[in-house]
């Protein structure tokens, strides 16, 4: 806290300008009117205040707006935003996407801080929906944002928002999230030709069902092993040896290195050993020749 002292003669600030950088902390406190600061917040960002000076300015705003800053002030906080705590931010009512963008710009290039997370959560919760413009803004600043959303929230994401998603943006998505995103991606990219389509859809295939993998196996896509290992186990199990061979193309040799890991391990256990032998990779663990294979899931469905 800065002690209350009288402003020295002739030092009363008439406007927010560069002369204030020469003021001591106590002089800023005594000589800058909080209401003036609030109306000229847009100027603060252009002036190279020290962190200590910014603390004083924040303190003045806190005194002026104990219940939380109005949006007209929030929009022009600039680097002063970095001084805000999540407790400060939860007093705000940010409704404009422009305000959100202005604040995200200040934090650009950094990890999502607790302050930014609070700001975003409050903004989205206040709107009651994650509309396309908001989502596009958030994924532009934080590409991994999509994978921080619940499957429930993702269900309201429009397919058009999928266009800008890059493979690395989906690195942290779990299977439940990909289950929701995959059909949207399929819809978004449906008018692309075969090879272009595969490039775009590849990162979403962790949510693909068996029938779509079977269809891809007919299109010479040459799926890499990293993508194959991220496929849903339940979607891979029904694929035949011939289908997996077509799906992976030249990458099929990589199955040997992954034979002890899911989904390859589980898939091997479901194949006839003589079918696996046709690959010439030495994969072991298939159903021995002469054994009868009962499809229990089909049996359950019939009963």
């Amino acid at each position: 806290e800065v002690e209350k002292t009288a402003c020295p003669s002739g030092k009363k600030a008439r406007e927010i300008d560069e002369s204030l950088i020469f003021y001591k902390k106590w002089e800023l406190e005594a000589c800058v009117d909080a209401a003036l600061l609030a109306t000229q917040m847009d100027r603060v960002n252009a002036i190279p205040f020290t962190y200590e000076q910014l603390d004083v300015l924040k303190h003045k705003l806190d005194e002026l707006y104990p219940q939380g800053y109005p949006e007209s002030v929030i929009q022009h906080l600039g680097y002063l935003f970095l001084k805000m705590s999540p407790e400060d931010i939860r007093k705000w009512n940010v409704t404009s996407l422009e305000t959100l963008k202005a604040l995200l710009e200040v934090n650009k290039g950094h990890e999502m801080s607790p302050q930014v997370a609070t700001l975003i959560d409050r903004f989205v919760k206040g709107r009651g929906q994650l509309d396309k413009d908001t989502l596009d803004t958030l994924t532009a600043f934080y590409p991994g944002y999509l994978c921080s959303l619940s499957p429930e929230e993702l269900s309201s994401v429009p397919p058009s928002s999928i266009w800008a998603v890059r493979p690395q943006d989906l690195d942290t998505c779990d299977p439940r999230q990909l289950d929701v995103l995959y059909p949207k991606a399929r819809l978004a990219f449906q008018n692309m030709n075969g090879s272009e389509y595969f490039v775009k859809i590849q990162s979403f295939l962790g949510g693909a069902p068996t029938e779509d993998l079977k269809a891809l196996s007919q299109q010479n896509v040459s799926m890499d092993l990293a993508t194959f290992m991220k496929l849903r186990t339940d979607a891979v199990l029904p694929l035949t040896v011939a289908e997996v061979q077509k799906l992976l193309g030249p990458h099929v040799e990589g199955l040997k290195a992954e034979e002890r890991h899911r989904p390859v391990r589980d898939w091997i256990l479901r194949q006839r050993q003589d079918d696996l032998d046709t690959l010439g990779l030495g994969l072991q663990g298939g159903i021995p020749n002469g054994y009868l294979v009962l499809d229990l899931s089909m049996q359950e469905a019939l009963s």
Partner: antibody
Framework: DVQLQESGPGLVKPSQSLSLTCSVT?????????WNWIRQFPGNKLEWMAY???????NYNPSLKNRISIIRDTSKNQFFLRLNSVTTEDTATYYC?????????WGQGISVTVSS | DIQMTQSPASLSASVGETVTITCRTS??????LAWYQQKQGKSPQLLVY???TLENGVPSRFTGSGSGTQFSLKIDSLQPEDFGTYYC?????????FGGGTKLEIK
């Protein structure tokens, strides 16, 4: 301020259908949010039943799926719960609530008893 | 379905004390967890959402924490109005499920 108010019968006979209305004031149910039905059993256990979203899509608790429906009347800013084939196990206080990350506005609840 | 295990089921504490309630989920829900307080004969009231963000008007003596499968709600310096039943609820995917509740009573 958003306000929600449940209405409907306080007593329903077994095997009949329960119909409840949630009237919303202070916010349009088509502008945003998820609009939910939740019930609280006599032992205080809470159960989420269903929601209808601002865009009209809905979702049900699988434990109730074959006997529950949720619809809305946007002109009256109301949404409705219908629960078929009720039993004494459906005796509870029924709440409607608005949500996004949490149920931040609730109705005061309506007590429903299923008894012959 | 994701199961919610809340503990303790009940606890008694004195005004001024600090208490912690925990909630464990059967699957990873990231930070999609809410905490509610309910007084006898009243509707539940949202206290915390997204695991740690306090709802408007909730006193700062309430603190939510955790992510993944382990969460907690801490109440510092208990006030008389804090006594009641507390519930956690996940919002990761439907069906949204609630914890069994923690009844906080005055010692």
């Amino acid at each position: 301020d958003v306000q929600l108010q449940e209405s409907g019968p306080g007593l329903v006979k077994p095997s009949q259908s329960l119909s409840l209305t949630c009237s919303v004031t202070g916010y349009s149910i088509t502008s945003g949010y998820y609009w939910n039905w939740i019930r609280q059993f006599p032992g205080n256990k809470l159960e989420w039943m269903a929601y209808i979203r601002y865009d009209g899509s809905n979702n049900y608790n699988p434990s109730l799926k074959n006997r529950i429906s949720i619809i809305r009347d946007t002109s009256k800013n109301q949404f409705f719960l219908r629960l078929n084939s009720v039993t004494t196990e459906d005796t509870a206080t029924y709440y409607c609530a608005k949500s996004y990350y949490g149920m931040d506005d609730w109705g005061q609840g309506i007590s429903v008893t299923v008894s012959s | 379905d994701i199961q919610m295990t809340q503990s303790p089921a009940s606890l008694s504490a004195s005004v001024g004390e600090t208490v912690t309630i925990t909630c464990r989920t059967s699957g990873d829900i990231h930070n999609y967890l809410a905490w509610y307080q309910q007084k006898q004969g009243k509707s539940p009231q949202l206290l915390v959402y997204k695991a740690k963000t306090l709802e408007n008007g909730v006193p700062s003596r309430f603190t939510g924490s955790g992510s993944g499968t382990q969460f907690s709600l801490k109440i510092d310096s208990l006030q008389p109005e804090d006594f009641g039943t507390y519930y956690c609820q996940h919002f990761w995917t439907t069906p949204y499920t609630f914890g069994g509740g923690t009844k906080l009573e005055i010692k």
